[in-house]
């Protein structure tokens, strides 16, 4: 995939932006007490463009799309208490914790901590 | 797909934008004389966001991506002359003529009008 675009010569005053915003995320599970955790969400305006096609095609289709998505994230365990469920008194949920975000090719998605 | 987002409460000063820019397009084919035609390309900054995943998933994955792409286009025939190709003296190329553009869901196929 081509590298993300941050500036366009046609619009020198415009810049792509993609931020990791702090959020309070509610982690829930049926029959269990929900927990609020601090997390981050990605939000932004990345560049996209589409140049007309020809048929038969003379060149590669000139379509570009960047999207604001996690550039680094990791998975953590969040344990929820489930009162009244004697056989399952607690449930362990896995939550993706977003570290930071960037404009990336739309078909692509976020990176996690090392293997 | 959810409707495209034009404004975000979190960023009241930011607006999605997607323009149809006039371009001169070179239509070519191997062994034929290229032609320059007037066309339009789509270019812009649409909104995208990504909210962290959980496992097992409590809700639908909260990922949204809009991209600047043709909202209306039609295919036109452009005939190219091919001197020295006696058996194929001309070639008809189909060219997508973009009428206007808008922010639309990233996976969406652009809509075309018939020839």
């Amino acid at each position: 995939a081509p590298p993300p675009i941050n500036k366009l010569a046609l619009f020198p005053d415009k810049s792509a932006w993609c931020e990791a915003k702090n959020i309070t995320q509610i982690v829930g599970h049926s029959g269990c007490e929900a927990k609020s955790i601090q997390n981050r969400a990605c939000l932004g305006q990345c560049f996209s463009y589409s140049v007309p096609n020809t048929f038969p095609q003379s060149t590669e289709s000139l379509v570009h799309c960047d999207s604001c998505m996690p550039a680094q994230s990791m998975w953590e365990i969040v344990t929820l208490e489930c009162p009244g469920h004697e056989e399952v008194p607690r449930v362990d949920k896995l939550v993706e914790k977003i570290v930071h975000c960037s404009c990336q090719a739309c078909g692509k998605e976020p990176s996690h901590e090392g293997l | 797909a959810p409707p495209p987002i034009n404004k975000l409460a979190l960023f009241p000063d930011k607006s999605a934008w997607c323009e149809a820019k006039n371009i001169t397009q070179i239509v070519g084919h191997s062994g034929c004389e290229a032609k320059s035609i007037q066309n339009r390309a789509c270019l812009g900054q649409c909104f995208s966001y990504s909210v962290p995943n959980t496992f097992p998933q409590s809700t639908e994955s909260l990922v949204h991506c809009d991209s600047c792409m043709p909202a209306q286009s039609m295919w036109e025939i452009v005939t190219l002359e091919c001197p020295g190709h006696e058996e194929v003296p001309r070639v008809d190329k189909l060219v997508e003529k973009i009428v206007h553009c808008s922010c639309q869901a990233c996976g969406k196929e652009p809509s075309h009008e018939g020839l």
């Epitope: 998505m69 998975w75 896995l94 692509k108 996690h112 | 995943n53 496992f55």
Partner: antibody, heavy 118, light 112 residues
Framework: EVQLVQSGAEVKKPGASVKVSCKAS????????MHWVRQAPGQGLEWMGI????????SYAQKFQGRVTMTRDTSTSTVYMELSSLRSEDTAVYYC???????????WGQGTLVTVSS | DVVMTQSPLSLPVTPGEPASISCRSS???????????LDWYLQKPGQSPQLLIY???NRASGVPDRFSGSGSGTDFTLKISRVEAEDVGVYYC?????????FGGGTKVEIK
Amino acid sequence: EVQLVQSGAEVKKPGASVKVSCKASGYTFTSYYMHWVRQAPGQGLEWMGIINPSGGSTSYAQKFQGRVTMTRDTSTSTVYMELSSLRSEDTAVYYCARAPGKFPLDYWGQGTLVTVSS
Amino acid sequence: DVVMTQSPLSLPVTPGEPASISCRSSQSLLHSNGYNYLDWYLQKPGQSPQLLIYLGSNRASGVPDRFSGSGSGTDFTLKISRVEAEDVGVYYCMQALQTPRTFGGGTKVEIK
């Protein structure tokens, strides 16, 4: 809907290589690692390795070190597993399976049968 | 590598009766965070494996509540409270604490 769709069955000669693909859809491709697990006819499951689709980093089981290569193409949300210097004992069904980080293999591909025979 | 040992190898069961499968690891699967990195999978005849239990005792989405996982450290158990005909197949435990991931040899559950 999460889907992992693998390439079709292959018949290979000893010494050859095979490249199996696994196309992911219905989720954020790089939010999850991808594992490869194989199963010889009538046998149990054997873990081969893991790839992080985001950065492309890999970790392989010692047994396959030097013979296996896992790669990914983020533009098509596809991971690949190439196994070289094939021998008859590599005849197996090869599965891709995704995992959230260090955690469980929650979705599996349908499997690809690779037959190594002279 | 962590060696995973399952027993029994084969388990003939009567529908409606309980069943139990044991899995032992050569090293403790209890992480310093207090969680056991042990998963259970079921491979039904002619199908890909499917996740049943993760982190020792958590049922995956859509898994009936007749399945439960327990244990800690090196000894783990998968229990089926009332076996149904659709539960036949090979059950595998897998440790997720270390690379390489390793599977138990499998336990074949079949109807008597």
